[in-house]
């Protein structure tokens, strides 16, 4: 057992150009607080995955109001350390996420508004009992300076907090076979209470006679390394030399997860999914209450009045997760039409429309004809977000600026000759044919296959169709 401690030294603009704007203003004073999330191992997990080693919230910092015209200074910080207790062995390697939150103290309806200012993450190796480690992390234009350490809680000692120490029974020296407990030279290493043969490097115990394995080791005495090499069965053959898991109880057998947590096997060990209000490797740590402000993004905390009762966060629309920490990506439903770019701004959904489209979801096809005349008597037709010209006879091209050759498409049927004319084209028909395009045969008896003639014209009269 032990405690991970985090000391924030400063949070403010980082070096270089583009200093961030102050997060607070005279109209909206605010204060900062921090959240730390710890996970065992060196996994690069999403920010929303469980903080299996634990999490902690700082107190709120002093209220800060921006001085108009002044550059954003280092912002006033909360007092004290952030402490994350761990009950089992310290894993030695861990991942951290540190979030800087802003609490706006203006006259919002329904109380203060919270928003995430910066999130930094990293993966580190750290021995328990060592000195403070200093770190600097940058998130955008912000810079966070902090120190951290892991220390064991008596009677545990050692780099993993797995050795136990007891006060000396005799003033001069420790009992037979027992060493002094560095750095507590006035204490002695406790008698071995784990199961006989339990690996001192890879196993530990909290109760006499047991042998619990650190991550990456298995077997009754924690002497078998867990391997991902191919095995004949899910737990592998019963040979310790193969590096496969020995058959027998699986890591989830007997459910090591406390407080109603559910266990799932991982390639190297097991993972507990904890109910709300509990965390830690085995869901054994509780104590977060509504007074700690565990619900982010304006979530409403109910229950959890004391450390033994779980809290529930009722999240505002657009946020999910047990602490309302996860923003829903509304753009995944592709609400913008016609190839518009979707932007989820949190308070609103915006679509950046392609040329030729408008409206809140780019649903309106703009009339591109506005202010775009088609030349030479052409008329503009709207469609597809781009204008199109329907050109007058004799003209073509996008804007009807090109003089067309009306004869290019060979419009005169039955061998008729085509002549371009200012108003279009004229067909000179071959003998035996007539009509604007020489499409009608003239019958030998003088009658034609023309449709009924207009009044005043007899079929067979010479005509010129334009």
């Amino acid at each position: 057992a032990g405690v991970f401690e985090l000391q924030i030294h400063s949070f403010g603009p980082g070096p270089g150009p583009g200093a961030p704007r102050s997060p607070c203003s005279a109209r909206l004073p605010c204060r900062l607080f921090f959240r730390v999330c710890l996970k065992p191992g060196l996994s690069e997990e999403a920010a929303e995955s469980p903080c299996a080693l634990g999490a902690a919230l700082s107190a709120r910092g002093p209220v800060y109001t921006e001085q108009p015209g002044a550059p954003a200074p280092d912002l006033p910080l909360p007092d004290g350390l952030l402490q994350v207790p761990f009950r089992d062995a310290w894993p030695g390697t861990f991942s951290f996420i540190i979030e800087t939150w802003r609490e706006e103290l203006g006259d919002q309806i329904g109380g203060p508004a919270w928003s995430l200012l910066a999130r930094v993450a990293g993966r580190r190796r750290l021995a328990a009992g060592g000195p403070w480690a200093r770190d600097i992390q940058r998130a955008g234009a912000w810079e966070l300076r902090f120190s951290y350490r892991a220390r064991c809680e008596p009677p545990a000692v050692g780099t993993a907090c797995t050795r136990l120490c007891r006060p000396r029974s005799a003033p001069s020296r420790c009992g037979p076979g027992l060493r002094p407990c560095a750095p507590l030279e006035d204490e002695c290493e406790a008698p071995l209470v784990c199961r006989a043969g339990c690996s001192p490097e890879h196993g530990f115990c909290e109760q006499p006679g047991e042998c619990r394995c650190l991550e990456g080791w298995t077997g009754p005495l924690c002497t078998v390394p867990v391997s991902t090499s191919s095995c004949l069965s899910p737990r592998g053959p019963s040979s310790a030399t193969t590096g496969c898991l020995v058959p027998g109880p699986g890591p989830c057998d007997g459910n090591p997860c406390a407080n109603g947590g559910s266990c799932s096997e991982t390639p190297r060990s097991f993972e507990c999914t904890c109910p709300r209000g509990f965390y830690g490797l085995r869901c054994e740590v509780s104590g977060v209450t509504c007074a700690d402000g565990p619900c982010f993004n304006g979530g409403l905390c109910v229950g959890g009045a004391d450390p033994d009762s779980a809290y529930i966060c009722h999240c505002p629309p657009g946020f999910q997760g047990s602490n309302c920490e996860k923003r829903v990506d509304r753009c995944s439903l592709q609400p913008c039409r016609n190839g518009g770019l979707c932007l989820d701004l949190g308070h609103a959904l915006r679509c950046r429309c392609r040329a030729g489209f408008a409206g809140p979801r780019c649903e309106h096809d703009l009339d591109d004809c506005a202010g775009r005349a088609c030349a030479n008597g052409g008329t503009c037709v709207e469609g597809g977000g781009a204008h199109r010209c329907s050109c007058a006879l004799g003209f073509g091209g996008r804007d009807c600026r090109e003089r067309a050759d009306p004869c290019a498409a060979r419009p005169c049927a039955h061998g008729g000759r085509c002549y371009a004319h200012f108003s279009g084209l004229v067909c000179a028909c071959a003998p035996g044919y007539m009509g604007a395009r020489c499409e009608f045969p003239v019958h030998p008896d003088g009658a034609s296959a023309l449709p009924a003639a207009p009044p005043g014209l007899r079929p067979g009269d010479p005509q010129r169709y334009l």
Epitope: R330, P335, L349, P360, R361
Partner: nanobody, 114 residues
Framework: QVQLQESGGGLVQAGGSLTLSCAAS????????MGWYRQGDLVAGFTSEG??KYADSVKGRFTISRDDAKNMVTLQMNSLKPEDTAVYYC??????????????WGQGTLVTVK
């Protein structure tokens, strides 16, 4: 104002099936997009262009359908797995008139797969 009413959640054995329904009511000019989310991620939905979209983890198991006359979407969930356990939220992007559109959420319906 627009309301989204979800139904169909419950407890089911692994490998079983459930059908979730979501009906939109109120001042609706048109529905632009509508679907189901869980744990902050899209499960399945109809995009603004009318095509069905699915999360990789549910392809082949879940089917989404729509009834435009009833302003309703239905999620048929087959071959359910324990990892499908979640609160499922209906979401819709709805035009209340020609130029006003807003995003709406349902209250959520719990699906538990044992």
């Amino acid at each position: 104002q627009v309301q989204l009413q979800e139904s169909g959640g419950g407890l089911v054995q692994a490998g079983g099936s459930l059908t979730l329904s979501c009906a939109a009511s109120g001042s609706i000019f048109s529905i632009n997009a509508m679907g189901w989310y869980r744990q902050g991620d899209l499960v399945a939905g109809f995009t603004s262009e009318g095509s069905a979209k699915y999360a990789d983890s549910v392809k082949g198991r879940f089917t989404i359908s729509r009834d435009d006359a009833k302003n309703m979407v239905t999620l048929q969930m087959n071959s359910l797995k324990p990892e499908d356990t979640a609160v499922y939220y209906c979401a819709a992007d709805i035009f209340s008139d020609r130029d006003h559109v807003d995003w709406y959420w349902g209250q959520g319906t719990l699906v538990t797969v044992k």
